[in-house]
């Protein structure tokens, strides 16, 4: 199942994805693709990073977080209804079949016709249950023994609506996180 995120037409969408580098500067290649994560790589790649930088992207897709610290959350500028669908964030951990794959569902809603409120909502996130280690409430940590030396932490938030700026900021601490090393 996918975590679901929402944005309105004309706004920017934010799809969170995180990992923890084994050491500062030890970046892991990441790809973002439109469509569910396939067995290998990303289908319909919209952005890619390598051990050094962002080395491929298409128009309107960019990383607004600190990708050098493992924040590889995707920003999609000025979304349209056609941007709805599943997106894959793939952390390309060295080794056979070590990749971590996260499917995120983006739902685009038509723009409101009524006058915008004082504080505009950029996006909302909804999902019934979270796994987190970031101290934002009850947390579970799951270690996958099948992936050597990797602790997998999946992070999301319980938020039907982002009603205040604190929640908007907290969304940066949501998404999918893995620890490498």
């Amino acid at each position: 199942s996918e975590v679901e995120y929402r944005a309105e037409v004309g706004q920017n969408a934010y799809l969170p994805c995180f990992y923890t580098p084994a050491a500062p500067g030890n970046l892991v290649p990441v790809c973002w693709g439109k469509g569910a994560c396939p067995v290998f790589e990303c289908g319909n790649v919209v952005l890619r990073t390598d051990e050094r930088d962002v080395n491929y992207w298409t128009s309107r897709y960019w990383l607004n977080g600190d990708f050098r610290k493992g924040d590889v959350s995707l920003t999609i500028e000025n979304v349209t209804l056609a941007d709805s669908g599943i997106y894959c964030c793939r952390i390309q951990i060295p080794g056979i079949m070590n990749d971590e794959k996260f499917n995120l569902k983006l739902v685009i809603k038509p723009a409101k016709v009524t006058p915008a409120p004082t504080r505009q909502r950029d996006f909302t996130a909804a999902f019934p249950r979270m796994l987190t280690t970031r101290g934002h409430g009850p947390a579970e940590t799951q270690t996958l023994g099948s992936l050597p030396d990797i602790n997998l932490t999946q992070i999301s938030t319980l938020a039907n609506e982002l009603r205040d700026s604190r929640l908007a900021n907290d969304l940066r601490d949501s998404g999918a996180t893995i620890r490498i090393g």
């Epitope: 500062p24 930088d53 962002v54 607004n64 977080g65 610290k69 500028e77």
Partner: antibody, heavy 121, light 107 residues
Framework: QVQLVQSGAEVKKPGASVKVSCKAS????????MNWVRQAPGQGLEWIGD????????KYNQKFKDRVTMTTDTSTSTAYMELRSLRSDDTAVYYC??????????????WGQGTLVTVSS | DIQMTQSPSSLSASVGDRVTITCLAS??????LAWYQQKPGKAPKLLIY???SLADGVPSRFSGSGSGTDFTFTISSLQPEDIATYYC?????????FGGGTKVEIK
């Protein structure tokens, strides 16, 4: 403390090659990319490329890729940048510089003193 | 390559003035902008990295803001020792590219 000490000024003829060295100390040489940046007289800064000493992986600015080679000697913590087929517009100060996140995610940024390369017939 | 457009190319201000320099990226670069100070005959010195973070040992009168494509560098109260040329640099996608520089002088 961290230091990057570069080789001395060079005067070269057009068509010749120059090899500039950069000796690093005060940090773990293999942990950070070594960048090379140049600055023509009275002009701005231009990135030439970088190399990661732990495996020799390098990335060059397309503008220089056919003429530049970057290498490192981890035994002496020294980086080298060789530029071939020199032209008069290669006259510049060449800097080595290393940057990136260090321990505790403190940003690490150090530059050599610069090496003036003059290309003249 | 990502182009960095810096403005103004030069400015003259009085001691104590607030000085603002802007840098515009041709494509979004997230937070990955650095600001350097360079004095004649010297290597560049890092002031700001990741758009807003002050480098170690840099006075707090220097600050940076912005993300995406639009960035601003501010000296809150210009001091005589701030006379230099300032460069922005993107560190989002190589080749790392610099702005054309802003020469700051005292009136």
């Amino acid at each position: 403390q961290v230091q990057l000490v570069q080789s001395g000024a060079e005067v070269k003829k057009p068509g010749a090659s120059v090899k500039v060295s950069c000796k690093a100390s005060g940090y773990t040489f293999t942990d950070y990319y070594m960048n090379w940046v140049r600055q023509a007289p009275g002009q701005g800064l231009e990135w030439i490329g970088d190399i990661i000493p732990n495996n020799g992986g390098s990335k060059y600015n397309q503008k220089f890729k056919d003429r530049v080679t970057m290498t490192t000697d981890t035994s002496t913590s020294t980086a080298y940048m060789e530029l071939r087929s020199l032209r008069s517009d290669d006259t510049a100060v060449y800097y080595c510089a290393t940057w990136g996140y260090g321990s505790s995610y403190r940003w690490f940024d150090y530059w050599g003193q610069g090496t003036l390369v003059t290309v003249s017939s | 390559d990502i182009q960095m457009t810096q403005s103004p190319s030069s400015l003259s201000a009085s001691v104590g003035d607030r000085v603002t320099i802007t840098c515009l990226a041709s494509q979004p670069i997230g937070i990955w902008l650095a600001w350097y100070q360079q004095k004649p005959g010297k290597a560049p010195k890092l002031l700001i990295y990741a758009a807003t973070s002050l480098a170690d040992g840099v006075p707090s009168r220097f600050s940076g803001s912005g993300s995406g494509t639009d960035f601003t560098f501010t000296i809150s109260s210009l001091q005589p020792e701030d006379i230099a040329t300032y460069y922005c640099q993107q560190l989002y996608s190589s080749p790392w590219t610099f702005g054309g520089g802003t020469k700051v002088e005292i009136k």
